[in-house]
């Protein structure tokens, strides 16, 4: 792959350059000082001169006036002001607002439900395969294999709690040691961040929205990947997570607690259980090498069963095979013993759509995968539309200021930590980091939350999901309590360690810069987002898995050269941006490489060729749907469905994304045309709440 996308005629710029104050700020900037605000109350930002040592020298000449794509958009309010309305108008507007709120909550409900169904669909499609990943004996000795198994399994079942509960049951059954379980937990942490990245893909329609949404989602991915990159070798070398958690578990005499409260599930379960119900024990049984489980279906058929535990007499070859000497007898010819047998009597069938279809798991999973993605996409579009119409003018200003403004000096640094607590608290309430971060994604997309503010919220979400796991561990039965608690604590301390690495010092907030860089690339080349998803969550883990199966020698033989090349490229990039003069003239830029190795443009041409035909067809369909939609809602200007068609023409435009040095991954200048920004819709009579 290209060392960096778009490095065409890059020339190091030795001169200092101008950059928006908001640009480099790792914490959320004060939006009252933001650029491109139309509100005349807000002063334009003063440009600050930054030395290359802080921000890195650009690889191309930049214009002095930069229109930062990361600045939050101002949603113009074209409606009649509240004060100018008559009584009838005010009442109408009030009920319109109530209606929108109900609609928003409704779509949000179905959005969360579709995430749950999506998880079930993934489990049906890949759950058994995921279970089989765990039954690999090499996990014990190879932490890298454990890591990728954690990633793959969590991606396949779309639930880190499912993969961690499998790990817990394997540890409590002595099939796995805590030491071997830690890399799997790290992998599960990575795997769980795919959900909100998928959700971000749903906002692909609008370039600027997609840029923000995708960056906001992938900030979670980068945090997890970077944390693992640093902490896995540290853990392998020192076993600090294992030691700390062991000390904690041994020093406290924990009593079995109660289950963590299911707050969100209480609302969503009545609906989701009508769609499908799964027997998640099957995956765990496969992971624990239960041969019978391999032929079991994950789709739950019987919901009400009567389990009768009885002791039956069975013959045994000799008294040595008896359950115990006191439970051994003879009938004069054969030896007998008493065995505990559980008779399961099916009483009532489950009440879900697939209960009587008797379809294979793959078929049910595929159906649900398609449907849940459609619902997810539809709900997301509607949520964004409703939020777009509600969050306008002063409402948007108030909300944005509340969320994105820091505490007054000298407590500004505390804001991020409060955001971490809020993220943890919210995740604890909804009982799922995927749900919380997925709900956050469209808000980042439409510009309500900055990436700088979303980052600590996401980190808090990572902590929140581990506190849920700790509570669940405390509710475990006696034999599983120690192992499940230790694993939950490992997960907790791993995330704490990650936060300490990538949050307290603004300079170390690499995930934000990397996510913004990826956001810029993906906004320009939208196929790259899917490519990134496949590479990072499937291909790399599967490659490592395959190489690990081949043995240590193969893994090292392939891995070391790859790692060496990556380090070489990164060092070269660093030198190119920081001190290019120390390099030979040829190495001061990437022009010595063929275009396909330094730019995504040739790749884009290939992808466009493949998708062009499909895109055209999709576009016609989209236009037809759109016209119908617009006629129904009687708003000829509100519908931007056919945007994809405009993008087809837009794709022909020749401008490339100028890319800067590695560590400024942000502030990449992209024209408004490339951003695909469009003015806010001016529908008939929009309400302004304030």
């Amino acid at each position: 792959m290209a060392p960096w996308p778009e490095l065409g005629d890059a020339q190091p710029n030795p001169d200092k350059y101008l950059e928006g104050a908001a640009g480099q700020q790792p914490t959320a900037p004060d939006k009252s000082k933001e650029t491109n605000k139309t509100d005349n109350t807000e002063a334009p930002v003063t440009k600050i001169e930054l030395l290359p040592s802080y921000s890195t020298a650009t690889l191309i000449d930049e214009p002095t006036e930069v229109d930062d794509p990361w600045n939050l958009p101002t949603l113009q309010d074209s409606g009649i002001k509240w004060s100018e309305r008559d009584t009838k108008g005010k009442i109408l507007c009030f009920f319109q607002g109530i209606g929108r709120l109900i609609l928003l909550l409704g779509f949000l409900y179905f959005f969360v439900c579709s995430l749950d169904i999506l998880s079930s669909a993934f489990q049906l499609v890949g759950g058994k395969m995921a279970g089989q990943f765990f039954s690999n004996s090499s996990i014990m000795s190879n932490p890298l294999l454990g890591l990728v198994i954690g990633v793959l399994v969590t991606v396949l079942v779309q639930s880190s709690s499912t993969s961690t509960s499998i790990v817990v049951s394997m540890v409590s059954s002595s099939l796995l040691t805590v030491r071997a379980a830690i890399p799997i937990i790290m992998g599960a942490n990575i795997g769980t961040s795919i959900t909100n990245t998928i959700v971000a893909l749903m906002q692909v329609g609008d370039r600027s929205e997609f840029r923000r949404a995708f960056a906001g989602a992938t900030v979670h991915d980068f945090f997890n990947w970077l944390s693992v990159l640093v902490l896995l070798p540290v853990e392998v070398a020192t076993h600090y997570l294992e030691i700390i958690t062991q000390l904690i578990v041994e020093s406290f005499h924990f009593k079995n607690g109660e289950d963590a409260p299911d707050l969100l599930k209480v609302i969503t379960k009545p609906f989701t259980k009508l769609i499908v119900q799964l027997d998640k024990k099957v995956i765990s049984q496969i992971a624990m090498n239960d041969e019978k489980a391999k032929n079991k279906s994950l789709v739950k058929i019987w919901c009400k069963t009567f389990t009768n535990k009885t002791q039956i007499n069975v013959t045994v070859p000799s008294t040595a095979n008896c359950t115990s000497p006191s439970l051994c007898w003879t009938d004069g010819i054969q030896n007998w013993t008493m065995k505990n047998v559980t008779y399961k009597e099916n009483i009532a069938k489950c009440q879900h759509i697939f209960v009587n279809f008797h379809l294979p798991d793959l078929a049910v999973g595929t159906i649900l995968l398609i449907l849940s993605l459609l619902v997810l996409c539809g709900c997301l579009i509607m949520i964004v539309k409703i939020l777009g119409s509600v969050l306008k003018g002063q409402v948007a200003t108030v909300i944005k200021k509340t969320i994105n403004t820091d505490f007054p000096f000298p407590f500004a640094w505390l804001t991020g930590y409060l955001a971490i607590l809020v993220g943890a608290g919210m995740t604890f309430i909804v009982q799922s980091s995927s749900v919380f971060t997925s709900a956050l994604t469209p808000l980042i997309g439409i510009g309500v939350i900055t990436i700088e503010r979303a980052y600590p919220l996401t980190l808090g979400s990572n902590i929140g999901t581990t506190t849920t796991a700790i509570l669940a561990a405390l509710a475990s039965p006696g034999n599983a309590l120690r192992s499940s608690l230790q694993i939950a604590l490992c997960h907790f301390f791993f995330n704490i360690s990650g936060i300490l690495l990538w949050y307290p010092i603004p300079f170390t907030r690499l995930p934000i810069r990397m996510a913004k860089g990826l956001g810029n690339i993906s906004a320009k080349y939208r196929w790259f987002a899917v490519f990134y998803l496949i590479i990072f969550f499937f291909l790399i883990p599967l490659t490592v898995f395959g190489l690990s199966l081949a043995g240590w020698r193969v893994l090292v033989g392939v891995g070391v050269p790859v790692v060496f090349i990556i380090i070489l490229v990164l060092c070269l990039r660093l030198l190119q941006s920081r001190c290019p003069r120390v390099l030979p003239k040829k190495l001061q830029n990437w022009n010595f490489l063929p275009l396909w190795m330094r730019s995504l443009k040739p790749w884009d041409a290939v992808v466009s060729k493949f998708t062009g035909c499909f895109q055209m067809r999709c576009c016609c369909c989209c236009r037809v749907c759109c016209r119908a939609c617009c006629l129904l809602c009687d708003c000829p200007k509100c519908c931007r469905c056919s945007k994809c068609c405009e993008d087809l023409e837009e794709a022909q435009e020749g401008q490339d994304v100028p890319v800067k040095a590695p560590e400024t991954f942000d502030n990449i200048t992209i024209s408004r045309e490339a951003q695909g920004e469009v003015p806010a819709s001016d529908s008939k009579t929009e309400c302004t709440a304030l």
Epitope: N313, T319, P325, S326, L327, C328, W329, T330, D331, G332, I333, Q334, N335, W336
Partner: antibody
Framework: QVQLVQSGAEVVKPGASVKMSCKTS????????MHWVKQAPGQGLEWIGA????????AYNQKFKGRATLTADKSTSTAYMELSSLRSEATAVYYC????????????WGQGTSVTVSS | DIQLTQSPSFLSASVGDRVTITCKAS??????VAWYQQKPGKSPKLLIY???TRHSGVPDRFSGSGSGTEFTFTISSLQPEDFATYFC?????????FGQGTKLEIK
Amino acid sequence: QVQLVQSGAEVVKPGASVKMSCKTSGYTFTTNNMHWVKQAPGQGLEWIGAIYPGSGATAYNQKFKGRATLTADKSTSTAYMELSSLRSEATAVYYCARGMYGHGAMDYWGQGTSVTVSS
Amino acid sequence: DIQLTQSPSFLSASVGDRVTITCKASQDVGTAVAWYQQKPGKSPKLLIYWATTRHSGVPDRFSGSGSGTEFTFTISSLQPEDFATYFCQQYSSNPLTFGQGTKLEIK
């Protein structure tokens, strides 16, 4: 009802053999073990062995192995015990008893066959 | 072989009395113990199996208890027809063995 009817008394000379029968009725002959128990005059009970008529499997008390042979005829629902090389201490009442399914308690007993070994 | 020792060997009691017979096994037999009643000139009759379970048709004045190596057989209120010889039997392992018997006589 379950009934076990044994053959009549036998008087035999030392060294000779004797074969006694136990005809059953009132239950499925092949599902329960058939035990044979010896009771010498004024003595306690002594287990000789058992046969499972369903398969013909047998088990013997080591003390009687080689001198007692247990057989069963499924067609007539009859169990047999043959005692060979009889000595005077073999004088006793021999009972056949039905074993309860799955364990060694004997719920129904025959009336007994008296064997007297005398020269 | 597992030895069973019954005590007492002889027992004199009156109608209405409560009578207890014990049976000790030379090793752990769990609860694989049965109790039989035998009247003179008759074949034995099963009363109790699994140490405590009464056989069908056996009056509830007969009861059994114990596990492991010590077992007791109790007649809560002696009736005239209860005077007979009582045997314990283990079926924990082959060969099946019986106690030497306890003869219950009228006082």
